[in-house]
């Protein structure tokens, strides 16, 4: 056990927020002004990530972990750990090549992301159109046809009641 | 070669001060992220201040902000660093260093001078 601990990596000593120096005896160096290391045991530090232009810094970079950033108002995040922005739209609308452009007839975007979607179609689960579409909103599909003909009503009538002191006959 | 020359050390009292400088040869101090760090009796290296992105921003630790400026004299090839309000927690080697970005995208840094001993006492 002891032969092994003496093989081990010198390096291995040093912990986050240091780089194993190798010109310097494998002594364990701070990382330099804007750079990192998240975890012991590297020979070199990582560059911060800058938030700059479109995106923001949403925490700050330390010796010890990397700078995160989010977008500026009017943008919101795509890709792992916020690695693009993209431009926000109005409800009701998509993002195109061409900017945003409002959704077709027959769809919907309740977000100011992400693409417009076909309204739900209610005859598919054979029920009827409650309240119709917009470009904003989906339908909302109420009771089936046939849930609505006369006499086939799910609505229970309450009892009638009865006058106190009276029995039934 | 890469030669870095500290200088300007020296025994000063409490809220004293001292311009340490740094001649350069081997690299442009204009074209390359420089700094200084120190290293106090017992204690590991420690970042003092930089300057990066070839001037565009200077780094302080939280320890110095307020007291040290760091600058360069670019037709002297020289980096400067002047501290004032001195503290005995300042008392170090001073060692000049140039930040060194790896083709991997790692960062490390060297100091190749022999540093100068800033010592604050009365």
């Known amino acids: 056990f002891e032969r092994t601990r003496s093989l081990q990596d010198p390096c291995s000593n040093c912990p986050a927020g240091t780089f194993c120096d190798n010109n310097r005896n494998q002594i364990c160096s701070p990382c330099p002004p804007n750079s990192f290391s998240s975890a012991g045991g590297q020979r070199t530090c990582d560059i911060c990530r800058q938030c700059k232009g479109v995106f923001r810094t949403r925490k700050e970079c330390s010796s010890t972990s990397n700078a995160e950033c989010d977008c500026t108002p009017g943008f919101h995040c795509l890709g792992a750990g916020c690695s693009m922005c993209e431009q926000d739209c109005k409800q009701g609308q998509e993002l195109t090549k061409k900017g945003c452009k409002d959704c077709c007839f027959g769809t919907f975007n309740d977000q100011k992301r992400g693409i417009c979607r076909p309204w739900t179609n209610c005859s598919l689960d054979g029920k009827s159109v409650l309240v119709n579409g917009t470009k904003e909103r989906d339908v909302v599909c109420g009771p089936s046809p046939a849930d609505l003909s006369p006499g086939a009503s799910s609505v229970t009538p309450p009892a009638p009641a009865r006058e106190p002191g009276h029995s039934p006959q | 070669e890469v030669q870095l020359l500290e200088s300007g050390g020296g025994l000063v009292q409490p809220g004293g001060s001292l311009r340490l400088s740094c001649a350069a040869s081997g690299f442009t101090v204009s074209a390359e992220d420089v700094g200084w760090v120190r290293q106090a009796p017992g204690k590991g290296l420690e970042w003092v201040s930089a300057i990066l992105d070839s001037g565009g921003s200077t780094y302080y630790a939280e320890s110095v902000k307020g007291r040290f400026t760091i600058s360069r004299d670019n037709a002297k090839n020289t980096l400067y660093l002047q501290m004032s309000s001195l503290r005995a927690e300042d008392t170090a080697v001073y060692y000049c260093?140039?930040?060194?970005?790896?083709?991997?995208?790692?960062?490390?840094?060297?100091?190749r001078g022999q540093g100068t001993q800033v010592t604050v006492s009365s």
């Open positions: 260093a140039r930040v060194v970005y790896h083709a991997g995208g790692g960062v490390t840094y060297d100091y």
